[in-house]
Interface confidence: low
């Protein structure tokens, strides 16, 4: 069976969100490679005036969990946990709408950062979404965006 690896996170860029928990990587060397890319992206984001506080509070951990997804401990084979689609949609359509539009039209950012495509994520309430990674975005004000 062809699968990836579950390995402890050893990086710095996302350590405050992930710690040394086990993350899913598609190859042995990929963790270091993604760490370099996300470090460069975060450096660029840090110097940008395009990122609002309300967006960055949730976008940064979301990007970390997308780049370094936790391993699904309920699975017998190495398998990544997805981001939760409802949170992904609120992030993209509400909290970070302007930032996403800017990022998707900026090749320098796209070169360094893979943005999650919410449509690829399993629907809320589906069995596949049961173990999704929840960032903790307050839902109440934005509930109508993911019905």
């Amino acid at each position: 069976e062809e699968d990836g690896f579950c390995q402890p996170y050893r990086g710095i860029a996302c350590a405050r969100f992930i710690g040394n928990r086990t993350v899913y990587m598609e190859s042995l060397h990929m963790q270091g490679e993604i760490e370099n890319q996300i470090t460069a992206a975060f450096t660029m984001i840090g110097t940008s005036s395009h990122l609002s506080d309300k967006c960055s509070q949730f976008a940064i951990p979301s990007l970390c969990h997308y780049a370094f997804p936790y391993c699904d401990e309920t699975s017998s084979v190495p398998k990544p946990r997805d981001l939760c689609r409802d949170e992904c949609e609120i992030l993209e359509n509400v909290l970070c709408q302007t930032e996403y539009i800017f990022a998707r039209s900026n090749p320098m950012i796209l070169m360094r950062l893979k943005l999650p495509n919410c449509e690829d994520l399993p629907q809320p309430e589906s069995p596949e979404a049961a173990n999704c990674i929840r960032i903790g975005i307050p839902m109440a004000d934005h509930h109508h965006h993911h019905h």
Epitope: E2, D3, G4, F5, Q7, R10, E26, S27, L28, H29, M30, G32, E33, N36, Q37
Partner: antibody, heavy 120, light 109 residues
Framework: EVQLVESGGGLAQPGGSLRLSCAAS????????IHWVRQAPGKGLEWVGY????????HYADSVKGRFTISADTSKNTAYLQMNSLRAEDTAVYYC?????????????WGQGTLVTVSS | QAVVTQESALTTSPGETVTLTCRSS?????????ANWVQEKPDHLFTGLIG???KRAPGVPARFSGSLIGDKAALTITGAQTEDEAIYFC?????????FGGGTKLTVL
């Protein structure tokens, strides 16, 4: 058919330089890591380093760090090993091997090797 | 740097089962070392057999299998054939580098 073909080996003086090439065919190197591995005469294998042609990320064995540089030209589907400050102990047959980015398949295909001799 | 040790030579007969092992100087070999087995035949013909401890590369016969036995990585050939006569190298991953063993010369008589 997947093939890796090394070239560029030969005789070099101690302190000299050589550049080895690893031309890939039958697959796109951007989907793989390319490793360089060497075998000194009558000895076992020694891992030299790898490149991810997709991003340019590299990693090296301590024995060659600072002297050897691995690069890739994705338009030519070729990886390179630039060897500087060569020493007698670098004498070996140098192989490139591929390692899937996607799956657990390190070193599945190898080239035939190219001999590097460092001698005055 | 870690040292990886293999039997220098083993002899088996056609149809027999033979196990080659791979020991690490740093302690027990674990799945985190992603043990890798490579076959060398005459004229420097190398083929990757096993990656990630126990995952066969495409096209490799099912008689080759990888596992952990005790504190070592192992390559087992179940029903050895004359064409399996070769040198077998194991390689272990140590966080950021691969280390190869010295190789085991397998003779199938």
């Amino acid at each position: 058919e997947v093939q890796l073909v090394e070239s560029g080996g030969g005789l070099a003086q101690p302190g000299g330089s050589l550049r080895l090439s690893c031309a890939a065919s039958g697959f796109n190197i951007t989907g793989y890591y390319i490793h360089w591995v060497r075998q000194a005469p009558g000895k076992g294998l020694e891992w030299v380093g790898y490149i991810s042609p997709n991003s340019g990320a590299t990693h090296y064995a301590d024995s060659v760090k600072g002297r050897f540089t691995i690069s890739a030209d994705t338009s030519k589907n070729t990886a390179y090993l630039q060897m500087n400050s060569l020493r007698a102990e670098d004498t070996a047959v140098y192989y490139c091997a591929r390692d899937s980015r996607r799956y657990v398949r390190p070193f599945d295909y190898w080239g035939q090797g190219t001999l590097v001799t460092v001698s005055s | 740097q870690a040292v990886v040790t293999q039997e220098s030579a083993l002899t088996t007969s056609p149809g027999e089962t033979v196990t080659l092992t791979c020991r690490s100087s740093t302690g027990a070999v674990t799945t985190s070392n992603y043990a890798n087995w490579v076959q060398e035949k005459p004229d420097h013909l190398f083929t990757g057999l096993i990656g990630g401890t126990n995952k066969r590369a495409p096209g490799v016969p099912a008689r080759f299998s990888g596992s952990l036995i005790g504190d070592k990585a192992a390559l087992t050939i179940t029903g050895a054939q004359t064409e399996d006569e070769a040198i077998y190298f194991c390689a272990l991953w140590y966080s950021n580098l691969w280390v190869f063993g010295g190789g085991t010369k397998l003779t199938v008589l």
